[in-house]
């Protein structure tokens, strides 16, 4: 057993049947030495009575709020959360994996740039009883720090006949230099609760690795005289690091017509203009990645031909 | 993805061009490496990440964009033991601090020579004769180097009497094919951003 | 998501009464330990009164002056408070008791000034 935070605590459990469970020994945080009753949940069943409760954790029934009182007040109280241990694996209920990049990816995170702020997600199935806390670091053994906001609900969405639940965190290295070269990853830690089942995920990555630039901004096209051609320009994104001749992007400039059959057209640059035939009913989109480092590339950035 | 090939113009800084091909060869390498050596622990995520050049050199703090200097957290050490002057200034007003730059980018450059050039003596002992480095990597490295045109000592390769471990060699290898690839990364932003200043 | 709205703050003079309600969802809210808790300009949060399994408590400084009740039907928690003095300007924030995480609401102000 383990305090996640004041009064409550996790109990770390073998699962499998008949399995002997973790006795605990609750004490009520009191001066007090007589006349003291404890409780589970909002039931008003007395459980035993003295300073101290031993309770025989087997199963989720076993968790919950103990509650010490004396003579209608609340003392004390201890919350038991349960961690599941199945087949020497802790389980992982309450989020969905997301396959991607990899199985068993939980967490996913990107960065807009390499100010040291970057955003987490993930997603789960369930719609109450639900909480997170997000802590993060530089490094494990000698940790720098991370400040992490409350992760909060992002989106919903319909998967068939489930509801999906998107939840995000912002966080920020306290102290980042962008041009850092990275020796140590970020590591991020997700307590989830849902109900009285607790449990635990975690990521690490290099920034430069999670790197993905916000789309190019005013993206506009200009007809060159007596040609099918125009120019097409844009600019840097607001949101990418400065200044752009250090922080420098290359880009993808695409044809696209108005059938996902048709052939597209694709052109690779460093400047942030070019000039492309623009076909009748086409689209030209433009995006974005970090010049020198391959991470990922932007969300594309459209505008119509005619 | 193979990056854009550039064609320096004419007035161009003389060093961009030799910088997208350093990272553009040690990047094959690496990726080569990664494929070759599938069964060690060459990914990103698998080896440690060791900086041979820490505390020798400090290309990151003396080659920071002006613009960055404001910044506290890039500040920690802003001193280096070098000054002098390179082929790389042609017909510029160059700060001191650039100066200190270029040399600092040399000596990893010369850091890096060595720690391959040794690496790859015991490589081509192995019996298994899995991977050798890339001539053209050593190559370019050499090329930026003597385009840096900086005056100093060549230093001996490094030799060893005993049996090398070929494993070690191996994982030794990727740690350092991925501490270089991150230095080429900084060495080609600095080089882009000297060309646009 | 766990959700806790509260009201019923405001200004009041020294000596005058509100009610505080704190509406919950995303949770069993008849499972939990609930409170109020408030925060002072410059100073820590600190437990105001709890309710859970039927018994109360309350901090020593408002005993006697402050009550807190609940009704499961309707996922509400009350705080009645009576004989409010200056030094109970602050904001109020309900939670679960123990406290989950970060499950505040986002609180109401309750200033207490002639």
């Known amino acids: 057993i383990w305090e996640l935070k004041k009064d409550v605590y996790v109990v770390e459990l073998d699962w499998y049947p008949d399995a002997p469970g973790e006795m605990v020994v609750l004490t009520c945080d009191t001066p007090e030495e007589d006349g003291i009753t404890w409780t589970l949940d909002q039931s008003s069943e007395v459980l035993g009575s003295g300073k101290t409760l031993t309770i025989q954790v087997k199963e989720f029934g076993d968790a919950g709020q103990y509650t010490c009182h004396k003579g209608g007040e609340v003392l004390s109280h201890s919350l038991l959360l349960l961690h599941k241990k199945e087949d020497g694996i802790w389980s992982t209920d309450i989020l969905k994996d997301q396959k991607e990049p990899k199985n068993k990816t939980f967490l996913r995170c990107e960065a807009k740039n390499y100010s040291g702020r970057f955003t987490c997600w993930w997603l789960t199935t369930i719609s109450t009883d639900l909480t997170f806390s997000v802590k993060s670091s530089r490094g494990s053994s000698d940790p720098q720090g991370v400040t992490c906001g409350a992760a909060t609900l992002s989106a919903e969405r319909v998967r068939g006949d489930n509801k999906e639940y998107e939840y995000s965190v912002e966080c920020q290295e306290d102290s980042a230099c962008p041009a850092a070269e990275e020796s140590l990853p970020i590591e991020v830690m997700v307590d989830a609760v849902h109900k009285l089942k607790y449990e635990n995920y975690t990521s690490s990555f290099f920034i430069r690795d999670i790197i993905k630039p916000d789309p190019p901004k005013n993206l506009q096209l200009k007809p060159l005289k007596n040609s099918r051609q125009v120019e097409v320009s844009w600019e840097y994104p607001d949101t990418w690091s400065t200044p752009h001749s250090y922080f420098s992007l290359t880009f993808c400039v695409q044809v696209q017509g108005k059938s996902k059959r048709e052939k597209k057209d694709r052109v690779f640059t460093d400047k942030t203009s070019a000039t492309v035939i623009c076909r009748k009913n086409a689209s030209i989109s433009v995006r974005a990645q970090d010049r020198y480092y391959s991470s990922s590339w932007s969300e594309w950035a459209s505008v119509p031909c005619s | 993805r193979n990056l854009p090939v550039a064609t320096p113009d004419p007035g161009m800084f003389p060093c961009l061009h030799h910088s997208q091909n350093l990272l553009r060869a040690v990047s094959n390498m690496l990726q080569k490496a990664r494929q070759t050596l599938e069964f060690y622990p060459c990914t990103s995520e698998e080896i440690d990440h060791e900086d041979i050049t820490k505390d020798k050199t400090s290309t990151v703090e003396a080659c920071l964009p002006l613009e960055l200097t404001k910044n506290e957290s890039c500040l920690n050490s802003r001193e280096t033991s070098f000054i002098t002057n390179g082929s790389c200034l042609a017909s510029r007003k160059t700060s001191f601090m650039m100066a200190l730059c270029l040399s600092s980018i040399y000596e990893d450059l010369k850091m890096y020579q060595v720690e391959f050039k040794t690496m790859n003596a015991k490589l081509l002992m192995d019996p298994k004769r899995q991977i050798f480095l890339d001539q053209n990597m050593l190559a370019v490295i050499d090329e930026l180097m003597q385009a840096l045109n900086f005056n100093s000592e060549t230093v001996p390769q490094k030799s060893s009497l005993e049996e090398p471990d070929f494993y070690k060699t191996k994982i030794k290898l990727c740690i350092l094919l991925h501490a270089f690839r991150i230095r080429a990364v900084t060495i080609d932003r600095v080089m882009s951003y000297l060309n646009a200043s | 998501q766990v959700q806790l709205v509260e009201s019923g703050g405001g200004l009041v003079q020294p000596g005058g009464s509100l009610r505080l309600s704190c509406a919950a969802s995303?949770?069993?809210?008849?499972?939990?330990?609930m409170s109020w808790y408030r925060q002072a300009p410059g100073k820590e949060h600190e437990l105001v009164a709890g309710?859970?399994?039927?018994?109360?408590k309350y901090a020593d400084s408002v005993k006697g002056r402050f009550t807190i009740s609940r009704d499961n039907a309707k996922k509400t928690v009350y705080l009645q408070m009576n004989s409010l003095k200056p030094e109970d300007t602050a904001v109020y924030y309900c939670?679960?008791?123990?406290?989950?995480?970060?499950?505040w609401g986002q609180g109401t102000q309750v200033t207490v000034s002639s």
């Open positions: 995303g949770f069993t809210f008849s499972s939990y330990g």
């Open positions: 309710i859970s399994a039927g018994s109360t």
């Open positions: 939670s679960r008791w123990p406290r989950l995480f970060e499950d």
